[in-house]
């Protein structure tokens, strides 16, 4: 007896983080034997949608012409072949931005920081929110989470960086999110440029010297210096 059908691949174009009102296409790719594709959305009646395969039958397209809150969430897809249904795909988390107005991102004491010193990025919301996310542009793992515990909402989250090195430099934005759904994010904050200058103790590497061997914020989470200032907030990384 043949083993289980291989799971399909699920992805979104142009990406899985979509601004409110923009279009997004979800693709599910199975095998050439697929006869039907099914898309399930977590906490929605299954199936969320069904599509016939596109030629040459190894994938199907699920179109969202205008992104709204209803489409944000966690999806899986399946395909049906003559021998039955496949295993589910790995989940796709479709996130919508623009659900809330933008927070304010600042650097304390300053966005100009000397290598080896400390800096704290502060994301502030004028209304209470329960999750704050810090994103660095062009980072492999850009999300740093601060999420409140016990539903206690906060107006701000602090992201300490210490000691700062040249790889911390770059452009950051933050988002905030409400308890309604963690798939709904605010508009992005205005960008903050963090500029790291060298010091006598820790000279800035020359352009010819590789710094990729030192794990920076792109490669591993920034560990907090001491406790998170707002006790209702718990630190998470993704």
């Amino acid at each position: 007896q043949a083993g289980p059908l291989p799971k399909p691949t699920l992805w979104a174009e142009p990406g899985s983080v979509i601004s409110w009102g923009n279009s997004v296409t979800i693709w599910c790719q199975g095998t050439l034997e697929a006869r039907e594709y099914r898309l399930d959305k977590e906490e929605s009646p299954a199936p969320w949608d069904r599509q016939n395969p596109l030629e040459p039958k190894n994938k199907a397209r699920f179109s969202i012409p205008s992104m709204t809150e209803d489409y944000a969430g966690r999806y899986r897809c399946y395909y049906r072949s003559p021998v039955g249904w496949s295993q589910p795909s790995d989940p796709l988390e479709l996130v919508m931005t623009g659900a809330y107005s933008k927070p304010t991102l600042s650097a304390l004491p300053s966005p100009l920081v000397t290598s080896g010193k400390s800096v704290t990025l502060l994301c502030q919301s004028r209304s209470p929110m329960d999750t704050f996310l810090l994103i660095k542009e062009r980072a492999a793992h850009p999300l740093l989470h601060l999420r409140s515990e016990h539903g206690a909402q906060q107006h701000q989250a602090e992201f300490p960086m210490s000691p700062v090195t040249s790889v911390h430099g770059g452009t950051y934005r933050c988002f905030s999110s409400h308890g309604f759904s963690h798939y709904l994010l605010s508009h992005p904050s205005d960008p903050l440029e963090l500029i790291v200058s060298g010091s006598l103790e820790d000279p800035r590497p020359s352009p010819t010297r590789s710094v990729s061997t030192a794990a920076g914020p792109e490669d591993q989470p920034l560990m907090p210096t001491g406790s998170v200032p707002h006790s209702g907030l718990r630190r998470h990384w993704e």
């Epitope: 809330y100 107005s101 209470p128």
Partner: antibody, heavy 120, light 110 residues
């Protein structure tokens, strides 16, 4: 020109209802702003009524004294904000303003105000 | 709740005087404080935001200072056009607030 224009004020009897409108021009209510309603009774100070977030979810917050009598809503297609006022009392007589919270968290744009008089 | 207490409620002064108005928050509001000027029959006008930043078009005789819970609006040399009522306001929005404004300070001619 960037502006807010209130309308819908007038004379209403105690216990009655009224809906005020705040039309935005020169910017979109669905961009990243909060909009508040503020009132000022004759000879008194400014009093915050409530606010609505321009994000798609449209979170609203109200002053504690509102106690469900007032409701803020919006119609993005008309770029207009509303204040529905029910169970009106004489002490609700005031000039009602809508105002935009800028990036600096301050009210950087105000309407001209509309007068609501609650009297029998 | 965040209460904003403004003082004095009335201030009598003369042209050329240095005038100081204070605003106290019942808990820290960081630097999220704004000051407004209002004249009879008109909407309030933003003077200062983020405690100390002058709004566009506001004369430099106006200045703001403070952070946390104590804030000050100063008019270095009072001009005839400055006789008005001034309000402070914190920038937070949430459901446990009675008001976001201070009670106001009327600056009148001595």
């Amino acid at each position: 020109e960037v502006q807010l224009v209130e309308s819908g004020g007038g004379l209403v009897q105690p216990g009655g209802s009224l809906r005020l409108s705040c039309a935005a021009s020169g910017f979109s209510l669905s961009s990243s702003y909060w909009i508040s309603w503020v009132r000022q009774a004759p000879g008194k100070g400014l009093e915050w009524i409530g606010s609505i977030d321009s994000g798609s979810v449209g979170i609203t917050y109200y002053a504690t004294w509102v106690k469900g009598r007032f409701t803020i809503s919006r119609d993005n297609s008309k770029n207009t904000l509303y204040l529905q006022m029910n169970s009106l009392r004489a002490e609700d007589t005031a000039v009602y303003y809508c105002a935009r919270h800028g990036d600096n968290w301050a009210l950087d744009l105000w309407g001209q105000g509309t007068l609501v008089t609650v009297s029998s | 709740d965040i209460q904003m207490t403004q003082s004095p409620s009335t201030l009598s002064a003369s042209v050329g005087d240095r005038v100081t108005i204070t605003c106290q928050a019942s808990q820290s509001i960081n630097s999220w404080l704004a000051w407004y000027q209002q004249k009879p029959g008109k909407a309030p006008k933003l003077l200062i935001y983020k405690a100390s930043t002058l709004a566009s078009g506001v004369p430099s005789r106006f200045s703001g200072s403070g952070s946390g819970t104590e804030f000050t609006l100063t008019i270095s040399s009072l001009q005839p056009d400055d006789f008005a009522t001034y309000y402070c306001q914190h920038g937070y929005i949430r459901g446990d607030l009675d008001n976001v404004f201070g009670g106001g300070t009327k600056v009148e001619i001595k």
